[in-house]
């Protein structure tokens, strides 16, 4: 088990949460492991228990404070350690000097709603959740629309290269059911990645007026 390939990946949500995944080929499912966070310039330490998410991977969330509190800054470094129980003692499996603002993954956008819908277009808005005020407007979004008979993977990506929390979808088919998703990413951070996709928003375009081409 010890010689299997290991991987430890963590992301900061920009406010008060560091989410981590630990994987190790050949490790036993009932292995007891935890992540320990040890900041370089703060008085707190934090630990979370790694819980199994698949055959050889475990995940946990380091909750650093209230969801919207700004617990870390761009100058912070947090040493993260994976510790696994071996008999009566804990064994260090991995260590990382984690730079939070180089490893960002925001929460999925929330509160998606249809602002206005017509036969061929639909205006949708959303909000970002637990995003640091440090970003100001330095965020980008990707959106996708699920059309009937297609999969999410086939949906073309629409890119919004600025902090724009709305979109006007065009060239839609009248009287048709669609679903819409959006995700967000800060421009900052060498290892920053996209947030999860938002919960899908279902909407239906208006039917075309009889005898009219709208």
């Amino acid at each position: 088990a010890v010689n299997g390939t290991s991987q430890f990946t963590c992301f900061y949500n920009s406010r008060a949460n560091i989410s981590c995944v630990w994987s190790q080929d050949g490790a036993l499912q009932d292995t007891s492991c935890q992540v320990h966070a040890w900041p370089d310039r703060r008085r707190w330490n934090q630990t979370c228990e790694l819980l199994p998410v698949s055959q050889a991977s475990w995940a946990c969330n380091l909750i650093l404070g209230a969801p919207d509190s700004q617990k870390l800054t761009t100058v912070d470094i947090v040493t993260l350690r994976v510790l696994c129980r071996e008999g009566v003692r804990w064994r260090v499996m991995a260590i990382q000097d984690f730079k939070p603002f180089e490893n960002l993954r925001l929460m999925a956008p929330i509160s998606l709603q249809v602002v206005h819908v017509e036969t061929h277009r639909c205006n949708i808005s959303w909000e970002i959740s637990q995003a640091s005020h440090y970003f100001e407007r330095h965020l980008e979004f990707e959106a996708r629309t699920l059309s009937p008979g297609h999969t999410w993977e086939e949906a073309p990506l629409l890119t919004l290269k600025q902090k724009q929390e709305w979109i006007c979808l065009e060239t839609l088919t009248p009287d048709t059911q669609y679903e819409f998703q959006v995700r967000v990413k800060p421009l900052q951070g060498e290892f920053t990645t996209w947030s999860p996709w938002s919960q899908p928003l279902a909407f239906r375009t208006k039917p075309a007026a009889l005898g009219k081409d709208t």
Partner: nanobody
């Protein structure tokens, strides 16, 4: 490209000291973790020590704790392994590794590694 070059190995007597060096080049290693592994003749490769580049936090395997010291010199882009009170069982090829994460489990989970330097401790 990224390179890690070990040096400082050699033949010594039991109880002597050696200092291994690992010079890293080819990228900014701040935020990385540097590890030393060793492979004794006819045995599996094993973890020895690691140090986080930014904060200088260290970790050792039990068998070298108190005898070996890992350190880094950011100005020289070099990681050192000071080995005191050497024993015949410390005989091995010592390899330096670098990664965004430092693993005690194995060398091949690191992003980069060197070629190794031979240490022989005679009784």
């Amino acid at each position: 490209q990224v390179q890690l070059q070990e040096s400082g190995g050699g033949l010594v007597q039991a109880g002597d000291s050696l200092r291994l060096s690992c010079v890293v080049s080819g990228r900014d290693f701040s935020g990385y973790t540097m590890g030393w592994f060793r492979q004794p003749p006819g045995k599996e490769r094993e973890f020895v020590a690691l140090i986080t580049w930014s904060t200088g936090r260290v970790h050792y395997t039990d068998s070298v704790e108190g005898r070996f010291t890992i350190s880094r010199d950011s100005a020289k882009n070099t990681v050192y392994l000071q080995m005191n009170s050497l024993k015949p069982e410390d005989t091995a090829v010592y390899t330096c590794a670098a990664g965004r994460v430092g693993y005690t489990t194995n060398l091949h989970s690191y992003d980069y590694s060197g070629q190794g330097t031979q240490v022989i401790v005679s009784a």
